[in-house]
Interface confidence: low
């Protein structure tokens, strides 16, 4: 349904409100060096002109794009060359190509301070001195850091972030009632980002079938009883929101999110009997809930997958008429028949029938080319079983902290050339799946470890892109999205490498680091473990744990001296120099 | 399974102190939030203080702010309340109790109880 | 401080009597960041340390019976026994989570007839 003036149409779908928070979303995802205060004037100019629009559709450039009119009011920044040098080129260019222009600019890891949260106090004096203002930033801040947040959901924390000031600062204990509250939204808010930045990876990279076949997998496991054509109709209108929201079309995507939660509630019956609740949510609480809802049991007697995709006559000619289709009521049928499955596992193995049926149904005797298809799942079914059994054990040995130490010296070096942080980081989130998936049963490990291992390596392909150093990470991040994991996975030492020159420097520390937090603390060691993996990659287990634990110690000896600046000065070359000594250096 | 065993308790003059203690084991104690709640002879029950054991954040009622501080061992999985100037109506069953990881003002396990008594 | 009102002092009910058990608060308990209320009931039996029943005013604590039930939203609060048991003898404590102190009703006695 075409309207006349888009901008209008957004504006009234989506409310002021909604509609002025969702243009600084946009804005803050392209511009993410701009000061908050310019940001601001901008978004205000914005809804400014879409008011006139609202009361005269026919009034002059109501009748742009929503691409042209953004992309205007971002190119008529004045630092914009400065600041962001040649991201400036864009705004020469012509809609689409500018758009597309500002989304490869898009920074995923932009060079911004750390967030430091201030004192409840403070907090709480600047939510009631000015609310708007207060929640307007927030939105701002993670915007900016987090260039592919999902806008919509960004929305929902922003109203819980609300709610949290509201409710703790007049609290007896601010914070006790508020800390926990935004260590809470920081925590989900990082999950949400590096999840929705699979997703975007997923349709920028791999396109739209990819994406499609990821949400018939995981659609079709949450509602098992849903008909294939009704699935296929949700899998259509969310490849649309999603679509929307990488592209950085962020007002249309929060509106068709909105219509796609009221569909689904009109339709429940014939969806999930478990969205009853959700349904009676208000919007944002509702779409989100529907997300994340859990999966409907599975219908009763469902017939044998056999019937249908190995023994029938036609299968082949199914297949001829409508591959995707086919392929696509396959994955439904086995998702829904597997919560217990990864979904990358699931596409794994729609992959493998795929390539079966292209090689059988060319054959002399089709049928008896693909009989024993399923015969082929065993092995990769059984791989990430294996993998996910042997890390659980490990880390219910070990502890988080010892686990992601195990994963950092194995990620290191297999992939040494990749930069420390980056390595430290992705390290620190792999090693999570411990504490986040081995605590449950064997039926919901697979689903929960290895789709949140495909979020973050994601993480670590996003990382590398921006500066690549390493083929094997590129060959494994570019060739199949569903084995990332795998192709990790199967990576051995990197026998290419040319060990790091030692610098001491590096292996010097300072007295600040007995103020930092644990958390803080724990990444200068794995900093200091990554960094000596890159210098003697052959070092045992032994070595390094015997390394370690000398730093260990050395840390908390300087942190309780009196002189502690002059004790890390002068331990720390001892320490060095046995360090050097024990692993040959 | 889920183990909260406090120990500690005693008689103790008025003005007397006191140092209670609570071993944890069973789940992964960094991430929870653990209180002490107490319980007069045959009155009901009566929170006093709590801690997240992740930060350390803490908070009391104000029947006991300024007198008892509450503190833990993360590498030990022990939580402490340490009682100064007692007073004869601190007198009780002290129970440590496990709140839930975001929604702390449940608790979930409990301990079996010290008995404080403070009396001349 | 919230301050939390139980109703009755005591009870007395034979086996397979429903009991109702009810709690009031002096102000709305319901979290602004989740639209749910944070009402736990606890049940103390004699000689024996609080076990959780039920927490959100009616979710059920695992491993409880389903003969126990939460109700109410805001400020009013029900807890039911649908049919009592020898077992169920005890006193029953609801109790506030939403903000500190965390503040327990005075206690419902329940007896065996």
């Known amino acids: 349904d075409a309207h006349k003036s888009e901008v209008a149409h957004r504006f009234k779908d989506l409310g002021e409100e909604n509609f002025k928070a969702l243009v600084l979303i946009a804005f803050a995802q392209y511009l993410q060096q701009c000061p908050f205060e310019d940001h601001v004037k901008l978004v205000n100019e914005v809804t400014e002109f879409a008011k006139t629009c609202v009361a005269d559709e026919s009034a002059e450039n109501c009748d742009k794009s929503l691409h042209t009119l953004f992309g205007d009011k971002l190119c008529t920044v004045a630092t914009l060359r400065e600041t962001y040098g040649e991201m400036a080129d864009c705004c020469a260019k012509q809609e689409p190509e500018r758009n597309e222009c500002f989304l490869q600019h898009k920074d995923d890891n932009p060079n911004l301070p750390r967030l430091v949260r201030p004192e409840v106090d403070v907090m709480c004096t600047a939510f009631h001195d000015n609310e708007e203002t207060f929640l307007k930033k927030y939105l701002y801040e993670i915007a900016r850091r987090h260039p592919y947040f999902y806008a919509p959901e960004l929305l929902f924390f922003a109203k819980r972030y609300k709610a949290a000031f509201t409710e703790c600062c007049q609290a007896a204990d601010k914070a006790a009632c508020l800390l926990p509250k935004l260590d809470e939204l920081r925590d989900e808010g990082k999950a949400s980002s590096a999840k929705q930045r699979l997703k975007c990876a997923s349709l920028q990279k791999f396109g739209e079938r990819a994406f499609k076949a990821w949400a018939v997998a995981r659609l079709s496991q949450r509602f098992p009883k849903a008909e294939f054509a009704e699935v296929s109709k949700l899998v259509t209108d969310l490849t649309k929101v999603h679509t929307e929201c990488c592209h950085g079309d962020l007002l249309e995507c929060a509106d068709d999110r909105a219509d796609l939660a009221k569909y689904i509630c009109e339709n429940q019956d014939s969806i999930s009997s478990k969205l009853k609740e959700c349904c009676e949510k208000p919007l944002l609480e509702k779409s989100h809930c529907i997300a994340e809802v859990e999966n409907d049991e599975m219908p009763a007697d469902l017939p044998s997958l056999a019937a249908d995709f190995v023994e029938s006559k036609d299968v082949c000619k199914n297949y001829a008429e409508a591959k995707d289709v086919f392929l696509g009521m396959f994955l439904y049928e086995y998702a829904r028949r597997h919560p217990d499955y990864s979904v990358v596992l699931l596409l794994r193995l729609a992959k493998t029938y795929e390539t079966t049926l292209e090689k059988c149904c060319a054959a002399a005797d089709p049928h008896e080319c693909y009989a024993k298809v399923f015969d082929e799942f065993k092995p990769l079914v059984e791989e990430p079983q294996n993998l996910i059994k042997q890390n659980c054990e490990l880390f219910e040995q070990l502890g988080e902290y010892k686990f992601q130490n195990a994963l950092l010296v194995r990620y290191t070096k297999k992939v040494p050339q990749v930069s420390t942080p980056t390595l430290v980081e992705v390290s620190r989130n792999l090693g999570k799946v411990g504490s986040k998936c081995c605590k449950h049963p064997e039926a919901k490990r697979m689903p929960c470890a290895e789709d949140y291992l495909s979020v973050v390596l994601n993480q670590l392909c996003v990382l590398h892109e921006k500066t690549p150093v390493s083929d094997r990470v590129t060959k494994c991040c570019t060739e199949s999205l569903v084995n990332r994991r795998p192709c990790f996975s199967a990576l051995e030492v990197d026998e290419t490498y040319v060990p790091k020159e030692f610098n001491a420097e590096t292996f010097t520390f300072h007295a600040d680091i007995c103020t930092l937090s644990e958390k803080e603390r724990q990444i200068k060691k794995q900093t200091a473990l990554v960094e000596l993996v890159k210098h003697k990659p052959k070092a045992t287990k032994e070595q390094l744990k015997a390394v370690m634990d000398d730093f260990a110690a050395f840390v908390e000896k300087c942190c309780k001296a009196d002189d502690k600046e002059t004790c890390f000065a002068e331990e720390g070359k001892k320490l060095v120099a046995a360090s050097q000594a024990a692993l040959g250096l | 399974e889920v183990q909260l065993q406090e120990s500690g308790g005693g008689l103790v003059q008025p003005g007397g102190s006191l140092r209670l203690s609570c071993a944890a084991s069973?789940?992964?104690?960094?991430?929870?939030?653990i209180h002490w709640v107490r319980q007069a002879p045959g009155k009901g029950l009566e929170w006093v203080s709590g801690?997240?054991?992740?930060?350390?954040?803490?908070y009391y009622a104000d029947s006991v702010r300024g007198r008892f501080t509450i503190s833990r061992d993360k590498a030990k999985n022990t939580l402490a309340l340490t009682m100064n100037s007692l007073k004869s109506e601190d007198t009780a069953v002290y129970y440590c109790?496990?709140?839930?990881?975001?929604?702390?003002?449940?608790?979930?396990?409990w301990g079996q109880g010290t008995q404080v008594t403070v009396s001349s | 401080d919230i301050v939390m009102t139980q109703s009755p002092r005591s009870v007395t009910a034979s086996v397979g009597e429903k009991v109702t058990i009810n709690c009031k608060s002096s102000?709305?308990?319901?979290?602004?960041?989740?639209?749910?209320?944070?009402l736990n009931w606890y049940q103390q039996r004699p000689g024996q340390s609080p076990r959780l029943l039920i927490y959100?005013?009616?979710t059920r604590e695992s491993g409880v019976p389903d003969r126990f039930s939460g109700s109410g939203s805001t400020t009013d609060f029900t807890l039911t026994i649908s049919s009592f048991q020898p077992e169920d003898v005890a006193v029953y404590y609801c109790?506030?989570?939403?903000?500190?102190?965390?503040?327990f009703g005075s206690g419902t006695r329940l007896e065996i007839k």
């Open positions: 109790a496990k709140g839930g990881i975001v929604y702390f003002g449940a608790y979930d396990s």
């Open positions: 069973g789940f992964t104690f960094g991430r929870y939030w």
């Open positions: 801690i997240s054991i992740g930060d350390g954040t803490t």
């Open positions: 102000q709305s308990v319901v979290s602004g960041s989740n639209q749910k209320s944070l």
């Open positions: 959100l005013a009616s």
């Open positions: 109790q506030q989570g939403y903000g500190t102190p965390f503040s």
